[in-house]
């Protein structure tokens, strides 16, 4: 027959926190007796000093007492609290026992710390003595700082605990402790049981997954049992009462707290951490001692307890590998149709947006790389002079160019434009060579020679010429535009050496020259060059700027002239022009 694989018995255990397809599913730690082997703090234990106690038994109508010694120093005669949570062997019962006759209003308490939050299903006590006449069970959810009642037992609920007897449990009060007289009989005199089931009779127990109230109700970090009143035969006040009183005490052979380590459906076991604290071994991207929050960077949807239908695992934020931190925003989650609420923090690699899903200002997407690539965003590198801004098109990378500028980064002049030296208008239109003849104007002469003498550009500058003109300025031609019978030059006035009645200011201005003057090169002027302009005051077409004509002197600028012109300026101030 077929041979058995040597590893057959070692098949990997199925993962309780995910299904066969690897999808997350609810998982819960094993059901345990959370009290087993744990220390119980008790308010009273017999045997210190050694004391007599008597065990009552009944034979028909006859009551028998057998007396023994409780001695805390003798292991054979001691009844320590450790016996509450040791292995419960019915054939060899070990019992914790209190001091004798601690009767109401004195009480005896047993306090058990579970070490972490548990979801408690039951609390049970098996007695070696008769069961108490009145007893309360309390729970703490904050490691013993505060206590809330879990259950009361008494034949006199109102008198002992100010609670109604067997009050009905409704949806409205299912997280409240009730008082009952069940389990309060004196008999059996030994071996009696009190078992409190936390969900018994609670209306939402059938839908526990969807009842936060009951989930909270069964949660405890500590359990306390308070024995309030002993059952007696009523003989404790008779003449020979000492024997009777030595017969009344509380003795318990077994304390059990049945439940599961609380992990909210996100862990299959609890383990000891480095501090030896009990914690859930969290799965589904959860964290915390009870898997009660999402682990860092898994904040795309709110933390939720797992249910039988939904694992409600925590989901990583989608930051396209550009952020290490994110936070949850409930309103964004709702606005997304309850799909995604994570907001990425400190997007790196020049990305931006809630998911670091687009490029930040000054960068654009390199479509050849996925958005997750660390170089998915490239710098726009818009030309500092040619571009109108630093932000480029997110997909094409095209920078916004100034007039006459082209190129993806706005780094060159467009066709029909030439470079200027102005940072404001770095590219200016190349002036269309004006026609030598123009039939459009009657005034315009047939022959330029009879109209004016075209300047040869080698003119000299002297005091006489300076004095004859109304203004003298150094200009930089930036741009030329045809405007009807005029050419309008945008010029930058660099220095003013003389001005007439109309004040000429430095900076960008308009210079107007008639078309016919330009046609006959009177004056001869080219964009992007610097000139010394000497002219007479005349009204310009737009009432602003300056006018030059055939009588104006336009000479290509030489830096050596600056000093000479300053001298002319000083002489003019001293009245030398009138003499010239």
């Amino acid at each position: 027959g077929p041979g058995l694989s040597m590893f057959a018995g070692q098949a990997a255990q199925p993962d309780p926190c995910s299904d066969e397809n690897g999808h997350p599913r609810r998982c819960i730690p094993d059901f345990v007796n959370a009290a087993f082997g744990k220390d119980v703090r008790v308010s009273s234990t017999c045997g210190r000093p050694p004391a007599r106690y008597c065990v009552v038994s009944e034979r028909g109508e006859e009551r028998l007492r057998s007396c023994h010694l409780c001695n805390a120093s003798d292991p054979k005669k001691a009844h320590p609290p450790a016996f509450l949570t040791d292995l419960n062997n019915p054939h060899n019962l070990t019992c914790w026992q209190s001091e004798n006759y601690l009767q109401f209003p004195h009480n005896v308490t047993l306090t058990l710390s579970l070490g972490k939050k548990f979801e408690v299903t039951y609390v049970s006590l098996q007695f070696c003595s008769p069961r108490p006449e009145s007893m309360a069970i309390y729970k703490s959810m904050d490691y013993g700082r505060t206590w809330v009642p879990f259950q009361f037992y008494s034949t006199q609920c109102r008198k002992m605990y100010n609670r109604p007897h067997r009050a009905p449990i409704t949806k409205q009060n299912e997280q409240e402790a009730v008082c009952t007289d069940s389990h309060t009989d004196m008999r059996p005199l030994s071996g009696g049981l009190i078992a409190f089931s936390t969900l018994d009779g609670r209306p939402s127990a059938h839908d526990f997954d969807n009842s936060p109230v009951l989930q909270d109700w069964v949660t405890a970090t500590d359990i306390r049992v308070a024995f309030s009143r002993l059952h007696t035969f009523g003989d404790e006040n008779e003449d020979d009462s000492e024997l009777a009183r030595d017969s009344y005490f509380y003795a318990v052979s077994d304390l059990q707290v049945g439940g599961r380590c609380k992990c909210n459906g996100h862990a299959a076991r609890c383990v000891r951490d480095r501090d030896d604290s009990l914690v859930c071994d969290c799965r589904h991207n959860t964290a915390g001692p009870e898997c009660d929050r999402c682990k860092p960077f898994h904040y795309d949807r709110p933390w939720q307890r797992a249910t039988a239908r939904e694992a409600n695992e925590c989901v990583a934020c989608n930051c396209n590998l550009h952020a290490r931190r994110c936070r949850f925003n409930m309103e964004l989650y709702k606005l997304s149709g309850r799909k995604s609420g994570g907001v990425c923090l400190n997007c790196r690699h020049n990305t931006a947006g809630r998911h670091c899903h687009y490029c930040k200002e000054g960068y654009y997407r390199d479509m050849g790389k996925p958005i997750t690539h660390r170089k998915a965003c490239k710098a726009c590198d818009c030309h500092p002079v040619g571009a109108a801004g630093k932000t480029c098109n997110q997909t094409t990378g095209q920078c916004p160019c100034k007039d006459g500028v082209t190129g993806i980064t706005c780094n060159r002049c467009a066709k029909g434009y030439q470079q200027s030296r102005s940072p404001i208008a770095p590219c200016i239109k190349i002036p269309v060579a004006p026609p030598t003849t123009a039939a459009s104007s009657v005034e315009e002469p047939e022959d330029c020679d009879s109209y004016c003498k075209a300047s040869k550009g080698k003119l000299k500058i002297n005091m006489k010429k300076y004095c004859k003109k109304d203004y003298a300025v150094q200009i930089h031609i930036l741009k030329a535009d045809k405007a009807g019978d005029w050419w309008k030059f945008t010029v930058n006035i660099i220095s003013v050496y003389k001005q007439g009645t109309s004040r000429i200011r430095r900076g960008d201005q308009s210079l107007w020259i008639r078309s016919r003057d330009i046609a006959c090169k009177c004056p001869k002027i080219k964009p992007l060059k610097k000139y010394l302009l000497l002219g007479n005051a005349e009204d310009s077409p737009d009432q602003s700027g300056i006018v030059a004509d055939k009588s104006s002197l336009v000479i290509q600028w030489r830096d050596t002239w600056a000093r000479r012109l300053r001298k002319f300026q000083q002489r003019e101030k001293k009245g030398k022009c009138k003499k010239a």
């Epitope: 606005l335 149709g337 809630r354």
Partner: antibody
């Protein structure tokens, strides 16, 4: 204290674009979503959309998708509603409202 | 979209009366419901959020309850100044929707 101050034209012509501004003060602008809600005369309230000023993410009521844009200017602590192709049926009071646990703060409309 | 249906559409009551308004959601909205009051010519005012939490400064006579699909808004003892239009609103899932008032 928290204030939401609205500004914009009282009237726009049909087919024109409505532009309303909501200027905030009294809290950290980027920490709360800003919503726009409108109310036709004598009618109920209608949620239009919202923006998260922290990063400019928006969410719109499908009814207005394509016509509605909500934007922010963090430097001015302002949120702007722009709605194109206005029609007489869009006649309403437009409110900006701060999100969070319910709309605790509203503009004057 | 989630519909929020308010009832009654209008009601008259006297000072001191206990007044209840209900709001029914077309699907479960957990407890993501708010209640507002609006007086003529004024912006709405938040009274209750998360179905039952009274907003800061709101008088204790106003209360809210419910979860899932059925919600109730109560004024325990009506005062003259309470005359207004009341709206419920869900913010469970986009688009946010209001009751008709």
């Amino acid at each position: 204290q928290v204030q939401l101050q609205q500004s914009g034209p009282g009237l726009v012509k049909p087919s024109q674009t409505l532009s309303l501004t909501c200027a905030i003060s009294g809290y950290t602008f980027t920490s709360y979503n800003m919503h726009w809600v409108r109310q036709a005369t004598g009618q109920g309230l209608e949620w239009m959309g919202a923006i998260y000023p922290g990063n400019g993410d928006t969410s719109y009521n499908q009814k207005f998708k394509g016509r509605l844009t909500i934007s922010k200017d963090t430097s001015k602590n302002q949120v702007v509603l722009t709605m194109t192709n206005m029609d007489p049926v869009d006649t309403a009071t437009y409110y900006c409202a701060r999100g969070g646990t319910g709309f605790a703060y509203w503009g004057q409309g | 979209d989630i519909q929020m249906t308010q009832s009654p559409s209008s009601l008259s009551a006297s000072v001191g009366d206990r007044v209840t308004i209900t709001c029914k959601a077309s699907q479960s909205v957990s407890n993501d419901v708010a209640w507002y009051l609006q007086k003529p010519g004024q912006s709405p005012q938040l009274l209750i959020y998360y179905a039952s939490n009274r907003y800061t400064g709101v008088p204790s006579r106003f209360s809210g309850s419910g979860s899932g699909t059925d919600f109730t808004f109560t004024i325990s003892s009506l005062e003259a100044e309470d005359a207004a239009t009341y709206y419920c609103q869900q913010d469970y899932s986009s688009p946010w929707t209001f009751g008709q008032g």
